[in-house]
Structure formats: C-alpha cells, structure tokens
C-alpha cells in the first residue's frame, strides 16, 4: 500500500502567439480544479476507461476574474497535494492523466457549468520511494508544470511497496537521566537467521547467529525481562549486558492512532484499526467519503458497497463522471435531425425544428404546405422547408388574401378594353386586333400574322359566352380540388402541429425557469 502524490506548480497560457488570456469564458469569473487518474501499464488507454490505480480530485481553486489590461498570469490554483492511495503493489509503469477543469460560476439548473480545459496524458516509469519527478507538459495552448512521486506506507517498503517491514522497537521515550534512544531502522521480511532459540518476540539479529534484545529484555536468547532495579543508568541495550534502558511507555500509551483509530499492541510495536475513510499506519491518511461532499452538480453520494470504494456518486441528468463533474454534451451527438437546433436544458434535451419538420427529434417531415393553405384558390408551391403561394388571378400577397385589380396594370394592348372578372380578366379588343391581350394585329384579308395563335374574342363573338362558361367551370373545379386537398392535409398534420406548439411552450417555460 502507498500513496501517489501530485503537486501542481503552475497552470497557465503556454509560450508563443495565440495563447489564451483567460481560462474563463465570456460568461464571467471561473475557477480551476484538477483531476488525476492513474492507470497501470504503459498502454494508451481511453481517458474514460476506469482509473484502475485510483483517481483524485483537487479542491477548487480561488475565483479568477480576468483583468482586462493585465498580462495573462499563472492562474490561481487549489492548495495542497493531490493524493491517490493505492492498496496493492505499485506497478512501476503507469499512465498519468491530469485534467484541468473549469468551473464557470453561475446559477444554472443542475449546478455550475463545468468544462474540461486541458488534459495531459503521460506514460511513465517510477519507483516508489524515489524523489519527486518534475515535468512540464503542454495541452493545446496551455502549459502545466507539476511534480509527482509514489511513496509506500508502513509497513510496506521497497520500489513496489511489496516488502513488509515492522519497526525493530516500539516507539519509546527515554526516562529521566537516561540518554536519548538511538534511532532504529526497520527490520524487513526475510531477516537473517538468528541464534537458535532467540526469542521471536523480544530478540532480533543483524548478522546470522546473533541474538540482540529489544528494550526491556535480556539474556542470551532475550527471554529474561529486565528488572528496573538492576538497570545500569546510561548503558545501552546489548546482548552481553544485563543493564538496559528503562522500558518506555507501552506502544499504545497515548493512543498513536489518529482520527478515532483504535490501538492494539503487537510484539514490539502497535497496530491501528482505522475507522471507515481513514488508513495508514496511524490512520493519519484520510479517504474521501460522502461526508466530504465529493459529488458535484447535485449528485447524490452513496457509501460504497465494499471498503475499497468509499463512495459512489449518482449523477443528475446531464452530468457524468465519477464525481458528476462532467457536463454531458448531448448535443454533440447531433440528435436533432433535418437541421433542427439542439437545446440542452441540463435536465432535458429539446430540439427546435426548422419549418416543415416536427417531432421530438424533428424526425417527421411535414408537407411544407400542410396547414398553410393559400386563400382564394391559390396553389401552394413547396421548396426547401419553406412555401409560397401561386395566387389565382385577381388575388395577391403571401397567402393570396389580398384582392388585386387585374386591370390596374393595363394588360390589354392596342387600346383593348379590360374587364375584371372573378376568374381573371377579359380583353375586349379594338377592331383589327385579337388575342388574349389583343396583342396580335388582324390582316385585312382576315389572316392573322401568327396563324397558329388562337383568334381573339371580340365583344359580340358568338363563341364568347360559351368559352367564358367553360373557363368558369374549369376554375371552380380546380379551386374545389385544392380546398379538399388542403383540408385533408390540415387534418393529417394537426396532431404534429399541436404537439410542436405544446413542446415549444414547455421549452420556453423551462428555459425561463
């Protein structure tokens, strides 16, 4: 067991042009925090895969507000180390992922806005117990300076924290008039073979065949408890003397276990039984629990089912991550079809559809003309999600609701007289002209200049009344057909329009909540 420690020294704009001035968006002040994720081995794993060696979140840093004229400084950072405890052996090779997160301060449903500002991933070799390793990494336009190390927690020692050691003697204080006790090193597993019969509890050896006694014990095999009256004052403990240091307080005196841990004596030492959330030789290392409020954005913290997972965060809609620290950008998946606008309301997702489309994801392709009937016999022309009306003669405007005077533009040529009619206009041509607009001259011999053109109707022509009647019947039939078509389409799409109006109302209400 041990702890990986990361110290962030600085985070700020990298050198060179295009460096950002501020980590905050235009929406106002923000502050930073860091997440460290450790994965075993040197494989380039996805950032979202589990942090198998552990992960930690820093505290939030001080609020940063950009000073308009000032140069972009190194940004204010959270205090303290990031510590990632590991229970098993330190792997030596690992992937180190450091994420810099921005918290935009503001009042939004589900909490403040979080966004990932920078992520650095390094594959590293590191022995436990070694010195701090320093590093500088660039992530986009940002530069991160940091140090890290891995250290074992007693009784584990070694480069992988796999060798178990116990102190040679219990922590003791020297009595009055006695010289200070010499500091003793750790005795590790696979010790030298001591003199046959040497007490396992009270003796130890540094060389094979030796039997040296712990304080309070004497004799060739360290089996004899020391009588305090025979103690020879300043003499130190030795395998050849009966004099010794006066035994100090018991190893559990004064309870060396912190944070409510309970102490039990072991041969020559002590052992702490730590309460949930603490670990280490003296229960001095604090693990994060629900009481620390580790879940961001209104996540619910639940104690883990086993001691290895102190807590689990259950995130509100729109957030994810082990601490609900990541806002889910659900719009990046482009859920709105047919060019619809995606709105992530935090707790819900809405699509605002382009004209001509409806449904929760704008998946229904509406007939552009449905529900947008052109009045007075006009016909609707679809196109690109929009519509326009081709109006019957005598009407104009966007929906053919405006009555037009067909004779206003003087459509009859060569002095023809214009008569407005409900189906359009009729030209009464002056003598010598014919055609729908009196555009063709009639030759003296009665042959038109354009023989293929139909002869114009002049007032008094016997066919005139019949032709007008035919035109009227045809126009009425067309108008009736259009009306039937429009009504059927209106009915067909009414439910979509109703749903769309309701949904827009809800969206408006939620956005203003």
């Amino acid at each position: 067991a041990g702890v990986f420690e990361l110290q962030i020294h600085s985070f700020g704009p990298g050198p060179g042009p295009g460096a950002p001035r501020s980590p905050c968006s235009a929406r106002g002040p923000c502050r930073l925090f860091f997440r460290v994720c450790l994965k075993p081995g040197l494989s380039e794993e996805a950032a979202e895969s589990p942090c198998a060696l552990g992960a930690a979140l820093s505290a939030r840093g001080p609020v940063y507000t950009e000073q308009p004229e000032a140069p972009a400084p190194d940004l204010p950072l959270p205090n303290g180390l990031l510590q990632v405890p590991f229970r098993d052996a330190w792997p030596g090779t690992f992937s180190l992922i450091i994420e810099t997160w921005r918290e935009e301060l503001g009042d939004q449903i589900g909490g403040p806005a979080w966004s990932l500002l920078a992520r650095v991933t390094r594959r590293r070799r590191l022995a436990a117990g070694g010195p701090w390793a320093r590093d500088i990494q660039r992530a986009g336009a940002w530069e991160l300076r940091f140090s890290y190390r891995a250290r074992c927690e007693l009784p584990a020692v070694g480069t992988a924290c796999t060798r178990l050691c116990r102190p040679r003697s219990a922590p003791s204080r020297c009595g009055p008039g006695l010289r200070p006790c010499a500091p003793l090193e750790d005795e590790c597993e696979a010790p030298p073979v001591c003199r046959a019969g040497c007490s396992l509890e009270h003796g130890f050896c540094e060389q094979p065949g030796e039997c040296r006694c712990l304080e309070g014990w004497t004799g060739p095999l360290c089996m004899v408890p020391v009588s305090t009256s025979s103690c020879l004052g300043l003499r130190g403990p030795s395998s050849t003397t009966t004099g010794c240091l006066v035994p100090g307080p018991g190893p559990c005196d004064g309870n060396p276990c912190a944070n409510g841990g309970s102490c039990s004596e072991t041969p020559g030492s002590f052992e702490c039984t730590c309460p949930r959330g603490f670990y280490g030789l003296r229960c001095e290392v604090s693990g994060v629990t629900c009481a620390d409020g580790p879940c961001f954005n209104g996540g619910l913290c639940v104690g883990g089912a086993d001691p290895d997972s102190a807590y689990i965060c259950h995130c509100p809609p729109g957030f994810q991550g082990s601490n609900c620290e990541k806002r889910v950008d659900r719009c990046s998946l482009q859920p709105c079809r047919n060019g619809g606008l995606c709105l992530d309301l935090g707790h819900a997702l809405r699509c605002r559809c382009r004209a001509g489309f409806a449904g929760p994801r704008c998946e229904h392709d509406l007939d552009d003309c449905a529900g947008r009937a052109c009045a007075n016999g006009g016909t609707c022309v679809e196109g690109g999600g929009a519509h326009r009306c081709s109006c019957a003669l005598g009407f104009g405007g966007r929906n053919c609701r405006e009555r037009a005077d067909p004779c206003a533009a003087r459509p009859c040529a060569h002095g023809g007289r214009c008569y407005a009619h409900f189906s359009g206009l009729v030209c009464a041509c002056a003598p010598g002209y014919m055609g729908a607009r009196c555009e063709f001259p009639v030759h003296p011999d009665g042959v038109s200049a354009l023989p293929a053109a139909p002869p114009g109707l002049r007032p008094g022509d016997p066919q005139r009344a019949g032709v007008i009647a035919v035109i009227v019947v045809v126009v009425i039939a067309i108008v009736a057909g259009i009306v039937v078509l429009v009504i059927s389409r209106k009915k067909r799409m009414a439910k979509y329009e109703k749903a769309e109006i309701k949904e827009m109302g809800e969206m408006h209400r939620e956005l203003n909540a």
Partner: antibody, heavy 119, light 107 residues
Framework: EVNLEESGGGLVQPGGSMKLSCVAS????????MQWVRQSPEKGLEWVAQ??????????HYAESVKGRFTISRDDSKSSVYLQLNNLRAEDTGTYYC??????????WGQGTLVTVSA | DIVMTQSQKFMSTTIGDRVSITCKAS??????VAWYQQKPGQSPNLLLY???NRFTGVPDRFTGSGSGTDFTLTITNMQSEDLADYFC?????????FGGGTKLEIK
C-alpha cells in the same frame, strides 16, 4: 453521523415574520446544497427553497408560493442554513424540515420545527 | 409545475404481502423520481432515487420501477416496520414536487 437540527419555529400572527435556523454536523457542510421542505396536513410535503454553494454564488431557488416572502441563506463557518419568513399567511403553517440537499433526492432530514400562523 | 399524483391515499395490507404503491407524473420526467418513507412522528427518509436505486441501508425488499410518467414502489414481504406514509418526488425540474402520499395500514 449526519445530524441536522432546526430551531426558531413557533406561533406567529398573519403578516408577521420569523427566522428558522438549522445547524448541521457530521459532514462537510460547505460542499452540500441545503434545502427547506415543509409539511402540512392540507398540502402534504412541499419543497420551499434551496441554496447552493459559495462557488455558485450561493444561488437560491424558491417555490412560487413563497417567492418574494421567504429568503434562504447560509453561513458555512457556522455550518448553518437559515430561512427568513416574512409576510406570513395561514397557509404557511406546517412543520419545516431542513434537508441536506442535492438534485437526486434529499438524503438527510432534520427533526423539523413547527410554524403556526394564526390570529 | 409537474404534478405528482398518488391516487391511493390509503392501502390496506397484511404482513408478508407484496404491496405496490403507484405515482403518476403530469409530464415526462424520465427516471428522475425518488421515494421517501415517513413513519408516524418522524421525518421522511430517502428510500429510492433515480426510480430504482436503493439508498444506503434500505432493505432489498424495497424496489422501484417505471419511467416517463408512471412509477411504482414495491415492497415484497411486507414487515410491520414498513407501516408508514410513502411519498414520491420528481427532480426533473424546478419546482421540485412531491406526491400527496400513500399510507400503508394493516387490514
């Protein structure tokens, strides 16, 4: 162990004011949203107000029925959350609970303090 | 506002029974529903969140189901200590709203 203790309730006349307090212990108070929920036989459980963290500029949200009359506040140094009740009405009568808030459910509740608005 | 309706104000049951309490939301709330238990003279306690997740220390005889607008809290093998009021609550949007409650009684 999480503990929430409300105080400040009592009898008050319509139009009157009072301030409810809630002292928290057993958790890192400054890292949690806090809320007030009230309960009456007539209206059942009713969410009243919520206050978020310092990092959220102590953003507050209120039920429509109390907006403009009630004010929620907190003092992280004292691990306390408060509810100032002004212009009280008969329908504000009920037991007011302080809850350790979040968005996914109210994990811990105090024992409640009774507010009675009556002439 | 989203209205949470618990249509049964009272339900009679016997020890060992399987009991299902229903709650209906006035609009789609996904799975953002919590359930609370309140024993006489006590404060409410969180039982389930996100429709079906049991909170710390809640026995596994309490289960939740549903999504959208219809939700159910089920108690299998009803115990005497389960006699209480049960409330649903939505946290899909402000204002956070509770159901009117369902009281479990012994037949």
């Amino acid at each position: 162990e999480v503990n929430l203790e409300e105080s400040g309730g009592g009898l008050v006349q319509p139009g009157g004011s009072m301030k409810l307090s809630c002292v928290a212990s057993g958790f890192a108070f400054s890292n949690f949203w806090m809320q007030w929920v009230r309960q009456s036989p007539e209206k059942g459980l009713e969410w009243v107000a919520q206050i978020r963290l310092k990092s959220d500029n102590y953003a507050a949200h209120y039920a429509e029925s109390v907006k403009g009359r009630f004010t929620i506040s907190r003092d992280d140094s004292k691990s306390s959350v408060y509810l100032q009740l002004n212009n009280l009405r008969a329908e504000d009568t009920g037991t007011y609970y302080c809850t350790q808030g979040n968005w996914v459910g109210f994990a811990y509740w105090g024992q409640g303090t009774l507010v009675t608005v009556s002439a | 506002d989203i209205v949470m309706t618990q249509s049964q104000k009272f339900m009679s049951t016997t020890i060992g029974d399987r009991v299902s309490i229903t709650c209906k939301a006035s609009q789609n709330v996904g799975t953002t529903v919590a359930w609370y238990q309140q024993k006489p003279g006590q404060s409410p306690n969180l039982l389930l969140y996100s429709t079906s997740n049991r909170f710390t220390g809640v026995p596994d005889r309490f289960t939740g189901s549903g999504s959208g607008t219809d939700f159910t809290l089920t108690i299998t093998n009803m115990q005497s200590e389960d006699l209480a009021d049960y409330f649903c609550q939505q946290y899909n949007n402000y204002p956070l709203t509770f159901g009117g409650g369902t009281k479990l009684e012994i037949k």
